[in-house]
């Protein structure tokens, strides 16, 4: 049996911490889904829809689940294992400096630049300049004209919000 | 397709141990955990406990703590059970189960392992 | 520990009939409730999970319902293959446990 697993085979991150006065480095962790009871005996199931647990943990309460923003949809409702995960709504975006909210993508793009990306969950329209290619970011000057274009369709999921 | 492939009948002899196995097949071995279950004849289930393919970590019901011990083999994708000690109260058929990911039902059961103790 | 009880050891049916298996749990256990059929020689199939969802093949006469310490299991229109043992379990908290069983027979 060459691949036997015994105790020795954890690594030190997968040992229980050696505070934790357990009989033994592997029945101090909770699997997904669960959180450590508080005299550290049992594991305790998350509460399904209402919060989870993504990895063997010692945590003596589940995380609380994402509830989804007004303006977001929800791609994958939260499990006792993974955490809702929602997405902007078509027409909006969440930014990685803004992760906050949705973002209203622009609707087009100022005069002599052309857009070469559609608005997704996670980014607004790109517009780039007709002659040098270099790309433009920033807001569309209210007095300039526009190149409208209706937004794109999502096409995979943003990250989680919350 | 899930299957759990148990170990056959052991008659064996009272404070003997005996080695029973649980081969896995159509998932990938080391991301579920195994549970033990037995079931004396004409009796109900009880929870024996876990084992984790993935890191080695195991979970006992306090009662059969003295009792079981588990391991594995990855390279055969086999988890074992020894139980010691054995005494008549041991007898009973012995199933390994797979759970879900979102909850720890037994979704996937073995055929099970009878286990007779007898002088 | 978490100790679950089917406080009837035998419910006599009949073919068509509704009948209602039930399970109480010594304490709240979050609607983690699962039911078994165990037929004589076989292992257990898992029917319900998280108190009322069918598992992947169950036929939808078997439906689960209840909430905090009050389970129950359902057989709308009772067929003479479901004559077996019905087992719930909590799979709330570590040591998980089983009812003692519900061994359903045909009149």
């Known amino acids: 049996e060459s691949a036997l697993i015994t105790q020795q085979d954890l690594a030190p991150q997968q040992r229980a911490a050696p505070q934790q006065k357990r009989s033994s480095p592997s029945e101090g962790l909770c699997p997904p889904g669960h959180h450590i009871s508080e005299d550290g005996r049992d594991c305790i199931s998350c509460k399904y829809g209402q919060d989870y647990s993504t990895h063997w943990n010692d945590l003596l309460f589940c995380l609380r689940c994402t509830r989804c923003d007004s303006g977001e949809v929800e791609l994958s409702p939260c499990t006792t294992t993974r955490n809702t995960v929602c997405q902007c709504e078509e027409g909006t975006f969440r930014e990685e400096d803004s992760p906050e909210m949705c973002r209203k993508c622009r609707t087009g793009c100022p005069r002599g630049m052309v857009k070469v990306g559609d608005c997704t969950p996670w980014s607004d329209i790109e517009c780039v300049h007709k002659e040098s290619g270099t790309k433009h970011s920033g807001e569309v000057p209210a007095v300039e004209e526009t190149v409208t274009s209706s937004p794109g369709t999502p096409a995979s999921p943003c990250s989680l919000s919350g | 397709k899930v299957q759990l492939q148990q170990s056959g009948t052991e008659l064996v002899k009272p404070g003997a141990s005996v080695k029973l196995s649980c081969k896995a097949s159509g998932y990938t071995f080391t991301e579920y955990i195994i549970h033990w279950v037995k079931q004396r004849s004409g009796q109900g289930l009880e929870w024996i406990g876990w084992f984790y393919p993935g890191s080695g970590y195991i979970k006992y019901n306090e009662k059969f703590k003295d009792k079981a011990t588990m391991t594995a083999d990855k390279s055969s994708s086999t988890v074992y059970m020894e139980l010691s000690r054995l005494t008549s109260e041991d007898s009973a058929v012995y199933f390994c189960?797979?759970?879900?990911?979102?909850?720890?039902?037994?979704?996937?059961w073995g055929q099970g392992t009878l286990v007779t103790v007898s002088a | 520990d978490i100790v679950m009880t089917q406080s009837h050891k035998f419910m006599s049916t009949s073919v068509g009939d509704r009948v209602s298996i039930t399970c109480k749990a010594s304490?709240?256990?979050?609607?983690?409730v699962a039911w078994y059929q165990q037929k004589p020689g076989q292992s257990p199939k898992l029917l319900i999970y998280?108190?009322?969802t069918r598992h992947t093949g169950v036929p939808d006469r078997f439906t689960g319902s209840g909430s905090g310490t009050d389970y129950t299991l359902t057989i709308s229109s009772v067929q003479a293959e479901d004559l077996a043992l019905y087992y719930c379990?909590?799979?709330?908290?570590?040591?998980?446990?089983f009812g003692g069983g519900t061994k359903l027979e045909i009149k």
């Open positions: 189960t797979r759970h879900e990911e979102d909850g720890y039902y037994a979704a996937y």
């Open positions: 379990q909590q799979h709330y908290s570590t040591p998980y446990t």
């Open positions: 998280w108190a009322s």
């Open positions: 304490q709240d256990v979050s609607s983690a």
